[in-house]
Structure formats: C-alpha cells, structure tokens
C-alpha cells in the first residue's frame, strides 16, 4: 500500500571490506548505517519534518508532475559511531566519528 | 551527458494561485523557489557537501544497486522570501518567511 512505501528508515548494514574502507578502518568490521527509503507524497506527514519548500514542491508535483519532482526521502539526523582507524600510520580510536548512521528520515 | 544530469539547482517558479495559497498569501503572486534535480553518483563532488553517510550510500549503490538506493539531490540551504499575508483577518507583512527558496543543493 502507499503507506507502506512512505518515507522511512530502513536497515542498511555496511561491511567496510565490501566498500574498501577496511584499508583504513580497523574496527568495527561494519555497522548499521540505515538508509532512508520511500516516497514523499503530499500531504507530507509531520514526523517527516518537511520544510516549507518541500511541502510546496510536493504540492506542485501533485498538481503537475512534469513541473516539479517529488520531495525526496533523506536523512535529517545522523549519529556518530566509534571506530579504530589508521591516521598517518597511527592506530587511533575515535569515540564519535560523526555523520555515519541515520537516526531520522524526512522529506526535503 | 552524465555531468549535465548531475545534482544541481534548477528553476522552479511557484504561482501561489496554482497551489491554492493565494487564499492567504496576498503578495507576491509567486516567486522563484528553485528545486534540486539530478543524480548523486559516486564519487560525490565536494561542492555538493555530501555527508559521510551519503558517500557510503553512493559507494554501496555503485557496487550493488539492489542493496542501497542512490543518495538524493536535495536542498541543503534554504532562504526566506518576503510576503504579505492574512493572519486572523489582519493583513501582515513578514520580511523573512523562512525556508521558501533553495540557495544550495547537495547529496544526502
């Protein structure tokens, strides 16, 4: 149904080896990054914290899909993860490596 | 070409009458809202200020398009416009009605 396909956070596990980042990230081997999937149809739900521009764009798209694209379902809040990584050859621990995992999605 | 289809700001003129907002916005009759259009393919250009999560998601999509969707081209900076509007029957002027026009696009 349309509601099931609406903008939401979905699982996305990242394996650092798969993307070649194991060359500098020593640990963890991967992490749950999540991703934002789904549509942003008008009217945009409040929990998706739409901007005024997103509301207008979704409304224009509803009236004329040729004139404007849909608003897009994207991360609106990201959280850090901890990593052990190589920094100029030094194994370094970083408690908060920012912007790595989605905590909230929204329509933009 | 691929570069021509890359994430960028494109014109989108909003006519308040067309979207039914002329019932409360008295002036202007419309404005240039712009929108963000185009693809966010890996590698993500620096001027699109990608988050680490967006870079990773684009990289995963490149390697396996089934596993992750592309990062999305969205407004990353919005600007206000000035409006004359009806507030409980009173014609009111607002110099900065925030979040109405795109000034920058990026990959998220």
């Amino acid at each position: 149904n349309a509601k099931g396909n609406y903008c939401k956070r979905t699982p996305l596990y990242i394996d650092f080896k798969e993307i070649g980042w194991d060359s500098w990230i020593i640990a963890p081997p991967g992490y749950e990054a999540y991703e934002c999937r789904g549509v942003c149809n008008y009217p945009l739900a409040e929990h998706l914290t739409p901007t005024k521009h997103a509301i207008i764009q979704a409304l224009v798209h509803l009236k004329n899909s040729q004139k404007a694209s849909k608003a897009c379902c994207v991360p609106t809040k990201l959280e850090p993860i901890s990593i052990l990584y190589l920094d100029k050859g030094v194994v370094t621990y970083k408690f908060k490596y920012e912007g790595m995992a989605v905590s909230e999605c929204g329509c933009r | 070409n691929a570069k021509g289809n890359y994430c960028k700001r494109t014109p989108l003129y909003i006519d308040f009458k067309e979207i039914g907002w002329d019932s409360w916005i008295i002036a202007p009759p419309g404005y240039e809202a712009y929108e963000c259009r185009g693809v966010c393919n890996y590698p993500l250009a620096e001027h699109l200020t990608p988050t680490k999560h967006a870079i990773i998601q684009a990289l995963v999509h490149l390697k396996n398009s089934q596993k992750a969707s592309k990062a999305c081209c969205v407004p990353t900076k919005l600007e206000p416009i000035s409006i004359l509007y009806l507030d409980k029957g009173v014609v009111t002027y607002k110099f900065k009605y925030e979040g109405m026009a795109v000034s920058e696009c990026g990959c998220r």
Epitope: Y13, P28, G30, Y31, E79, I81, S82, F95 | -
Partner: antibody, heavy 115, light 111 residues
Framework: QVQLKETGPDLVQPTQTLDITCTVS????????VHWVRQPPGKGLEWMGT???????DYNSAFKSRLAISRDTSKSEVFLKMDSLQTDDTAKYFC?????????WGQGIMVTVSS | QFALIQSDSMSTSLGSTVTLSCKRS????????VYWYQQHEGRSPTTMIY?????PDGVPDRFSGSIDSSSNSASLTINDVQVEDEAIYFC??????????FGGGTKLTVL
Amino acid sequence: QVQLKETGPDLVQPTQTLDITCTVSGFSLTTYNVHWVRQPPGKGLEWMGTMWNGGGIDYNSAFKSRLAISRDTSKSEVFLKMDSLQTDDTAKYFCARLGYYVDYWGQGIMVTVSS
Amino acid sequence: QFALIQSDSMSTSLGSTVTLSCKRSTGNIGSSYVYWYQQHEGRSPTTMIYDGDKRPDGVPDRFSGSIDSSSNSASLTINDVQVEDEAIYFCQSFSSGIKFIFGGGTKLTVL
C-alpha cells in the same frame, strides 16, 4: 547513574557453553561500546571482544569461532556466549563501557570450569 | 602480532616517584596510543591514562603517561606515591590484528 552488571553461572562443566548477560543502565548501547574482558585468577586482563555502538562486533582471534557476542538494545543487554569451555577458561568475566576511554566496568562474574 | 611487556612487580617507597614501563615487542610504540589501568586487589580496573597522556576526571595529576621512542616503551609515572597507589597496573594498546592488547601487568608495592 551508569551501571553494568554481569549475570550468569558460577560453575560450568567442561565442554559446555557459557552464557553471560551484561545489563546496563544510565546509557544507551547505540551510543556507547561494550567490551568483554576476562581475567584468570592471579593473571592479567584479556580482551575477548567488543559490541560496537553501530552494531558491528569484533572478536579476539584467540577465541577462534567459539565466541559470540550480541545485544538487545531495547533491553539494554549485551550477551557473551562461549562454547567448548575448558578448565583454563576459569576466570572473572567483565563487561566494560567504552566511551572516549573505558570509563565504567561491571563488578565481574567469577566463572569456574570444573566437573 | 606484537606483545606489550611489563615487569611482574616493582617496589617503591611512600612519597617517592616511580615509573612503570610497557615495552612493545615488535613495531613502533608510537604507532598506536597507550592506555593505563589500575586494579586494586579484588576490584574492577579503572582507567588512569588514555590516548597516551590524558587523565580522566578524578585521576590525580600525580599520574602521567609518556612514550620513549628510544626504548620503544610507554611509561606511567607516579609522583609522590601514596599507600592507595598500591595496585596492579596494566598497559593497553591497539593493533590491526587483536584489536585491544593488554600488557601482563605490574604489581606495585608501596613500602
């Protein structure tokens, strides 16, 4: 306030499986990392593995494939499961919180492997 | 895979200065940060030094960490040694193999 508490058996038969739960309070497992560390009587500390805040897990290769770490974030619990125990696995088992550094430890649980 | 080598025991007198050593067996001691833990008899360990030379809140400034490249060692120095400093001290570092490596520990006795 921040607390970590290990619960599990005091005594395990050789060849059997050890299950320990670390129940935490005062912080989120999606923000902080949790180490499992053990200490045989009169000996040093040995890192066993880490449950990372992002959901990834690292193991000390010395434990080969007999160690499994998992978590239930909704219950604020981290689990250690180790198979095929031998007498030299007799030790105090600690869970510890890793933030900018290891700032909180559980009191530890003494596990004896004996028939 | 490297090891972190600590002497089994050391004695020191009240009010003096003592330096505990943690030698890396292979590879450069400077290629990963060193952490120091204190463990009193029958208690859980506590962090005394992290990132080589930083002290957590509550750790007296009598404790300091450093690195000596010439001996490929990390050191924990305790000034004005107190009775309560009697404990076992463990160093810990990182590697790309076994991610978190502990030294064997040094038992410090205060006379």
